[in-house]
């Protein structure tokens, strides 16, 4: 059968719109059908038929602070690929995209285990930065998948104050839409 598109991705997320990206299947296709609807919505989804040459679409007139389910099907005449499905929340509407309750849950003289509560939006990944509080040395940075809500920071100096910051990245990796960060200070 016809291969599905792959790599569903989201960017340019606002309260009323976001852009969906995907990777075309290798097979010859005539176009795509993109459907979207709010999660837990039983009505008829909105549907766009898009030419084969496109691999993105901006969905508009969305409801703020709402999780949307987006499905993409590749078409070749009457033949349809299996669904590619993704979910993305719009901004605003009282739904924050900032991680909450960042804390150190375990520590050694040279490492920290941090934990936070995920925001109520789809997070692609978290970007974590840490560095000596008030220090001149550059901060270190790493990422963890959006499915995680803990991270270990190692290689620290004993007895030093560190500032740790967690950003939720909700856009594409090459053009991240980062939330406001949450930060804490901790002395090893």
């Amino acid at each position: 059968g016809l291969d599905s598109p792959t790599g569903i991705d989201f960017s340019d997320i606002t309260a009323n719109s976001f852009t969906v990206h995907w990777i075309a299947p290798r097979a010859t296709i005539t176009g795509y059908r993109i459907r979207h609807h709010p999660e837990h919505f039983s009505g008829r989804p909105r549907e766009d038929r898009v030419p084969h040459s496109r691999n993105s679409i901006t969905l508009t007139n969305l409801t703020p602070g709402t999780e949307y389910v987006v499905s993409i099907v590749a078409l070749n005449g009457r033949e349809e690929s299996p669904l590619l499905i993704g979910q993305q929340s719009t901004g605003g509407g009282g739904v924050s995209d900032v991680p909450r309750d960042l804390e150190v849950v375990a520590a050694t003289p040279t490492s920290l285990l941090i934990s936070w509560d995920a925001p109520a939006v789809t997070v692609r990944y978290y970007r974590i930065t840490y560095g000596e509080t008030g220090g001149n040395s550059p901060v270190q940075e790493f990422t963890v998948p959006g499915s995680k809500s803990t991270a270990t920071i190692s290689g620290l100096k004993p007895g030093v104050d560190y500032t740790i910051t967690v950003y939720a990245v909700t856009g594409r990796g090459d053009s991240p839409a980062s939330s406001k960060p949450i930060s804490i200070n901790y002395r090893t």
Epitope: I34, R46, E47, D48, R49, V50, P51, S53, R54, N55, S56, I57, T58, L59, T60, N61
Partner: antibody, heavy 115, light 107 residues
């Protein structure tokens, strides 16, 4: 007979706004993607935007964040809201039926951005 | 973006002449190539789509060929109403892009 009729063009200062309309008839408007294509004076054709049957959109990088395409299927009308206009946006703007193979075009409306 | 290059930029020909315009894509576009005719002060008109399929109502003296990166529009016997500017357009990948145009003038 398919007909597309643009309106709303005119002279606007840099930084200003303008809304173009395209009235469609002779086909089931709601079932088709529609596009805007522009042509600067004495120059070639440049794709501006698409809007698909469900209202989803795509834009050229040169207008992204400044132009918004919308449609009102109950009025068989396509719109192009143009904000933060620049001198380089000066062109005849055409609406065209479908994306990719532009099988029908309007007569165009001239937008001049100048102080 | 895919660049489309037409040649020649302009040509002079007489009624009855066979005219050939070429269009080259900067990368393969399969057969996703369309040709348009535009007369001064008028909107473009679709002549040929998918490289070689004649749009309904277009005279059979117009034909298109090619695939991959090299394409040709041929007018087998130029008529007075054919003096115009011709554009190619790739529809293989977004954004769709046009050639710079070929102006066909009367010799």
């Amino acid at each position: 007979e398919v007909q597309l009729l643009e309106s709303g063009g005119g002279l606007v200062q840099p930084g200003g706004s303008l809304r173009l309309s395209c009235a469609a008839s002779g086909f089931t408007f709601s079932s088709y993607a529609m596009s805007w294509v522009r042509q600067a004076p004495g120059k070639g054709l440049e794709w501006v935007s698409d809007i698909y049957d469900g209202g989803g959109t795509n834009y050229a990088d040169s207008v992204k964040g400044r132009f918004t395409t919308s449609r009102d299927n109950s009025k068989n009308t396509l719109y192009l809201q143009m904000n933060s206009l620049r001198a380089e946006d000066t062109a005849v703007y055409y609406c065209a039926k479908t994306a990719d193979n532009f099988d029908y075009w309007g007569q165009g409306t001239l937008v001049t951005v100048s102080s | 973006d895919i660049q489309m290059t037409q040649s020649p930029s302009s040509l002079s020909a007489s009624v009855g002449d066979r005219v050939t315009i070429t269009c080259r894509a900067s990368q393969s576009i399969s057969s996703y190539l369309n040709w348009y005719q535009q007369k001064p002060g008028k909107a473009p008109k679709l002549l040929i789509y998918a490289a070689s399929t004649l749009q309904s109502g277009v005279p059979s003296r117009f034909s298109g060929s090619g695939s991959g990166t090299d394409f040709t529009l041929t007018i087998s016997s130029l008529q007075p109403e054919d003096f115009a500017t011709y554009y190619c357009q790739q529809a293989n990948s977004a954004p769709t892009t046009f050639g710079q145009g070929t102006k066909v003038e009367i010799k």
